[in-house]
Interface confidence: medium
């Protein structure tokens, strides 16, 4: 058993048929000795009397808010949550496996630059009685501070018959050093509580591995005289780290016909312009990636050839 | 070539070679994100490698103030990785394929370190840890870890030389 926050406790249970459960002893937090009774949740049924209550916690029916009273007055209460372990593995019922980049990926995180700011998100099909709390640090044995905001519902999607809810959180490393080579990973821990079920999810990464720049901005076409060629130009996204002479990007320019089946022409360049042939009804797209470290490409920025 | 006594290196040459190093490091181990090597208890292996840290003066301001601190740190790292790539971790079984980019990577690390340190000018280098795994699979895992770590190191080095070439070249 351990304390999640004041008066909220998590009981870790091996979850299998006829498991013995855990014997938990609750003591009423009061100097009173006599006339104390215990109830569970909203029920008025008296579970026991006396300063201590011993319960065998085996299933969700044994969890909940235990309250001790005297003469109609509430003296103290303790909320017991359950954390299930099946076949030695902690349950992951609350969040959806995103399966990207690999199986058992419940949390996904991205950073737009090297400032130490990043966003993580996760998915669930649960709509009510759900709370999340997020903690983060750089390293685990001697952790350095990372401050995370509150998790918020950021999107709702319909997937077949089910609704899917996306939650996200923004975190900022307290004393980030954008130019340094990271040696300790960022650790992100999400506590999830659904009704009386507790679960925790973790992710560990280097900022450099979760970098995904915003798309290039101000994408423009300038036709070249007496030619089917155009000069495409663009700028670094505003959110990218500066100076750009240090934090450089590389770019991929793509000419794509109207039909997805048409051959795509691609050019790679470190410059912020390129000359390409603009076919009728085609579009030109540009995306960006860190020049020196192969993290994710940005989304495409596009303009029509016409 | 760099000149002893703390004057500027050949920023543009260093820029070109460090960018080539980035390309080679990624072609030697392109598996980004597919193998979470940090779960394989790599504290004792890759924690020993030299990292370019916050106080090493490799940020734009630090380079403007005095690039020698940073260049010395980069040189240490290049020598360290050059020795690792020449050790039995990479020369032992399982043998590298004849066209493996590791050979080129090894030569380029040496080339860049020589650009940074001319004859008769010696910076102290870090001791290479005695990592000699007995099993071929351990060697393979260690190679991946070293290459992943090298990718991060050369990325910072390449940023330094790109910025130097753009802003500090005479």
């Amino acid at each position: 058993i351990w304390e999640l926050k004041k008066d909220v406790y998590v009981v870790e249970l091996d979850w299998y048929p006829d498991a013995p459960g855990e014997m938990v002893v609750l003591t009423c937090d009061t100097p009173e000795e006599d006339g104390i009774t215990w109830t569970l949740d909203q029920s008025s049924e008296v579970l026991g009397s006396g300063k201590t209550l011993t319960i065998q916690v085996k299933e969700f029916g044994d969890a909940g808010q235990y309250t001790c009273h005297k003469g109609g007055e509430v003296l103290s209460h303790s909320l017991l949550l359950l954390h299930k372990k099946e076949d030695g593995i902690w349950s992951t019922d609350i969040l959806k496996d995103q399966k990207e980049p690999k199986n058992k990926t419940f949390l996904r995180c991205e950073a737009k630059n090297y400032s130490g700011r990043f966003t993580c998100w996760w998915l669930t099909t649960i709509s009510t009685d759900l709370t999340f709390s997020v903690k983060s640090s750089r390293g685990s044995s001697d952790p350095q501070g990372v401050t995370c905001g509150a998790a918020t519902l950021s999107a709702e999607r319909v997937r077949g018959d089910n609704k899917e809810y996306e939650y996200s959180v923004e975190c900022q490393e307290d004393s980030a050093c954008p130019a340094a080579e990271e040696s300790l990973p960022i650790e992100v821990m999400v506590d999830a509580v659904h009704k009386l079920k507790y679960e925790n999810y973790t992710s560990s990464f280097f900022i450099r591995d979760i970098i995904k720049p915003d798309p290039p901005k101000n994408l423009q076409l300038k036709p070249l005289k007496n030619s089917r060629q155009v000069e495409v130009s663009w700028e670094y996204p505003d959110t990218w780290s500066t100076p750009h002479s240090y934090f450089s990007l590389t770019f991929c320019v793509q000419v794509q016909g109207k039909s997805k089946r048409e051959k795509k022409d691609r050019v790679f360049t470190d410059k912020t312009s390129a000359t390409v042939i603009c076919r009728k009804n085609a579009s030109i797209s540009v995306r960006a990636q860190d020049r020196y470290y192969s993290s994710s490409w940005s989304e495409w920025a596009s303009v029509p050839c016409s | 070539r760099a000149v002893p006594g703390g004057s500027s290196p050949a920023w543009t040459q260093c820029q070109q070679l460090s960018q080539k190093l980035c390309t080679l490091a990624w072609s030697a181990h392109p598996l980004v994100g597919h193998m979470d090597l940090r779960e394989e208890g790599d504290e004792e292996t890759t924690n020993d490698v030299p990292h370019i840290q916050c106080g090493d003066g490799c940020d734009p301001q630090g380079l403007r103030d005095n690039s020698q601190f940073c260049l010395q740190r980069i040189h240490q790292g290049l020598i360290f990785y050059e020795k690792l790539l020449g050790s039995d971790i990479f020369t032992g079984e399982p043998s590298l394929l004849p066209d493996s980019p590791v050979g080129q990577l090894h030569a380029s690390l040496l080339g860049l370190s020589q650009l940074l340190q001319p004859e008769g000018h010696h910076w102290e280098t870090q001791q290479i840890p005695s990592l000699s795994p007995s099993q071929p699979w351990q060697r393979l895992l260690l190679r991946f870890k070293i290459l992943r770590s090298l990718q991060a190191f050369v990325a910072v080095a390449a940023r330094v030389f790109a910025h130097g070439a753009a802003t500090l070249s005479p």
Epitope: W2, E3, K5, K6, S78, S140 | -
Partner: nanobody
Framework: EVQLVESGGGLVQPGGSLRLSCAAS????????MYWVRQAPGKGLERVAP????????LYADFVKSRFTISRDNAKNTVYLQMNSLKPEDTAVYVC?????????????????WGQGTQVTVSS
Amino acid sequence: EVQLVESGGGLVQPGGSLRLSCAASGFTFSNYWMYWVRQAPGKGLERVAPLNPGGTITLYADFVKSRFTISRDNAKNTVYLQMNSLKPEDTAVYVCAAPSGTLYTRNKSGYIYWGQGTQVTVSS
């Protein structure tokens, strides 16, 4: 300097009782969960019982079966283990420990403070 000093161990006959004490100093005792753990000859560490800072929540290991009671006195910086109906298999070194964490005690990273332990021998 952090110190945890156990006392109260000794030789006792089966069915007998002992009260172990653990006096703490050098850290904010009232912020920490406290644990009694034991190590029998040739066996690994076994957690006997944890107790939250307020002394209101505990959970006993299966082998305890209502025979042991853990309590604490935050004014005296002391945690106790009252052991009744002792059996030969309770023979072990009993150690008090504080886990690495105060309020948020996940206890994944082991114990941060340890005592030296007190020997309990149950034999006729």
